[in-house]
Interface confidence: low
């Protein structure tokens, strides 16, 4: 905490300008008026203050706005935003997409910090849902944003917003998240024709159930291996060798390179070796001839 002392003669700030970088911390505390700082926040970003000096400026704003900063100040925080704690940000009411963009710009190129996560959470909750413009903005700054949301949070994404999602935005989504997003994408793209539909839905297929994969296998989609590897294991397991062959088309040869990885390794274990041999890829590990396959999950469901 900076000790309270009087401002030395001739040092009182009348403008927020570069002369302030030569002020000691206690001089900034004593000589800069908080209200002046608030009205000239847009200048702070252009001045090379030290981190310690920024701490003093933040302290002054905290004193002026103990209930949380107004949006007019928040929009111009610039690098001072990096000094905010999640607790500070929870007091804010950010409604403008421009304010959100301005603050995200400050953190650009870095991983999503707890501060940014809190800011986004406040903004989205204030809007009531993750609309297309917001999603566009967030995924532009953080391609992994969508995948940082819980399934519960994702449930508030309207199907119309799915059009803003790019394949790279889903790279780090886990199956539970894709389970929520896939039905929305299916709804959003339902009026597209076969090949266009597959291009759009492809990134979401990690949430697709078995029956949808079976349906796709009838449409000559030629799914690539990268997409296949992201499918839910439980959705892939019931697929027959013929269905997988149709689903992958010419890409079926790639199964060999992935035979040790999920879901391919688990799928192989469920197939008859005879059926696997029809692919001519040398896949090993299937059920040998003469073995009886019991569906234990069905047995459990009946008991």
């Amino acid at each position: 905490e900076v000790e309270k002392t009087a401002c030395p003669s001739g040092k009182k700030a009348r403008e927020i300008d570069e002369s302030l970088i030569f002020y000691k911390k206690w001089e900034l505390e004593a000589c800069v008026d908080a209200a002046l700082l608030a009205t000239q926040m847009d200048r702070v970003n252009a001045i090379p203050f030290t981190y310690e000096q920024l701490d003093v400026l933040k302290h002054k704003l905290d004193e002026l706005y103990p209930q949380g900063y107004p949006e007019s100040v928040i929009q111009h925080l610039g690098y001072l935003f990096l000094k905010m704690s999640p607790e500070d940000i929870r007091k804010w009411n950010v409604t403008s997409l421009e304010t959100l963009k301005a603050l995200l710009e400050v953190n650009k190129g870095h991983e999503m910090s707890p501060q940014v996560a809190t800011l986004i959470d406040r903004f989205v909750k204030g809007r009531g849902q993750l609309d297309k413009d917001t999603l566009d903005t967030l995924t532009a700054f953080y391609p992994g944003y969508l995948c940082s949301l819980s399934p519960e949070e994702l449930s508030s994404v309207p199907p119309s917003s799915i059009w803003a999602v790019r394949p790279q935005d889903l790279d780090t989504c886990d199956p539970r998240q894709l389970d929520v997003l896939y039905p929305k994408a299916r709804l959003a793209f339902q009026n597209m024709n076969g090949s266009e539909y597959f291009v759009k839905i492809q990134s979401f297929l990690g949430g697709a159930p078995t029956e949808d994969l079976k349906a796709l296998s009838q449409q000559n989609v030629s799914m690539d291996l990268a997409t296949f590897m992201k499918l839910r294991t439980d959705a892939v397991l019931p697929l027959t060798v013929a269905e997988v062959q149709k689903l992958l088309g010419p890409h079926v040869e790639g199964l060999k390179a992935e035979e040790r990885h999920r879901p391919v390794r688990d799928w192989i274990l469920r197939q008859r070796q005879d059926d696997l041999d029809t692919l001519g890829l040398g896949l090993q590990g299937g059920i040998p001839n003469g073995y009886l396959v019991l569906d234990l999950s069905m047995q459990e469901a009946l008991s």
Partner: antibody, heavy 118, light 108 residues
């Protein structure tokens, strides 16, 4: 109760082979796989491979490919690991573990100390 | 292969304190494929959590897990004397399965 009981400690010379056994009890052996993990003295855990009991499908760590063989005998609910061409850096405690829910290793054997020394 | 990096290497805490152990993966790992193990001297490892946050049978509620992508955390809310041990994270998303180097939680 569910448990895995491993064979006793072994002292081997470089170039020799060792066979470690792991006897399962308390559960249906063929329902689960068995994984093998080793731990050199004072070091962390290293996965060696696993075997699926019902169809004997194996996956080995690339590092040991060609030197390790994992087998099972379903009649005695026992899994075996053979490591050939032993070197001094193979000195470690060798553990077998049941590959349970979510492929996590939910039950572990007590470990078998294998010492390779000339 | 996926490299697992645990930090800190050693955590010195007193009984009753909260322990937070970190595990970072070199590639993104789906939550379903991350487990945590506890190992005490002279004993075999014991499964604590699988699927990032699901407690194994018999594991007390003070153990919890979180994280996604490449960053995962094991939290022990209030350390008990029997919790002082080495903790390992492990992924089984891609072969070879790999373990972290371990975090030793020792009595301060």
């Amino acid at each position: 109760q569910v448990q895995l009981l491993q064979s006793g400690a072994e002292v081997k010379k470089p170039g020799a082979s060792v066979k470690v056994s792991c006897k399962a009890s308390g559960y249906t052996f063929t329902t689960y796989g068995i994984s093998w993990v080793r731990q050199a003295p004072g070091q962390g855990l290293e996965w060696l491979g696993w075997i699926t009991a019902y169809n004997r499908n194996t996956n080995y760590a690339q590092k040991l490919q060609g030197r390790v063989t994992m087998t099972t005998d379903t009649s005695t609910s026992t899994s075996f690991m053979v490591l050939r061409s032993l070197r001094s850096d193979d000195t470690a405690v060798y553990y077998c573990a049941r590959v349970g829910d979510s492929d996590a290793f939910d039950i572990w054997g007590q470990g078998t100390m294998v010492t390779v020394s000339s | 292969e996926i490299v697992m990096t645990q930090s800190p290497a050693t955590l010195s805490l007193s009984p009753g304190e909260r322990a937070t152990l970190s595990c970072r993966t070199s590639q993104s790992v789906f939550n379903s494929f991350l487990s945590w193990y506890q190992q005490k001297p002279g004993q075999a490892p014991r499964l604590l959590l699988y699927g990032t946050s699901t407690r194994a049978t018999g594991i007390p509620a003070r153990f919890s897990g979180s994280g996604s992508g490449t960053d995962f955390t094991l939290t022990i809310s209030s350390l008990q004397p029997e919790d002082f041990a080495v903790y390992y994270c492990q992924q089984d998303y891609k072969l070879p399965l790999t373990f972290g180097g371990g975090t030793k939680v020792e009595i301060k």
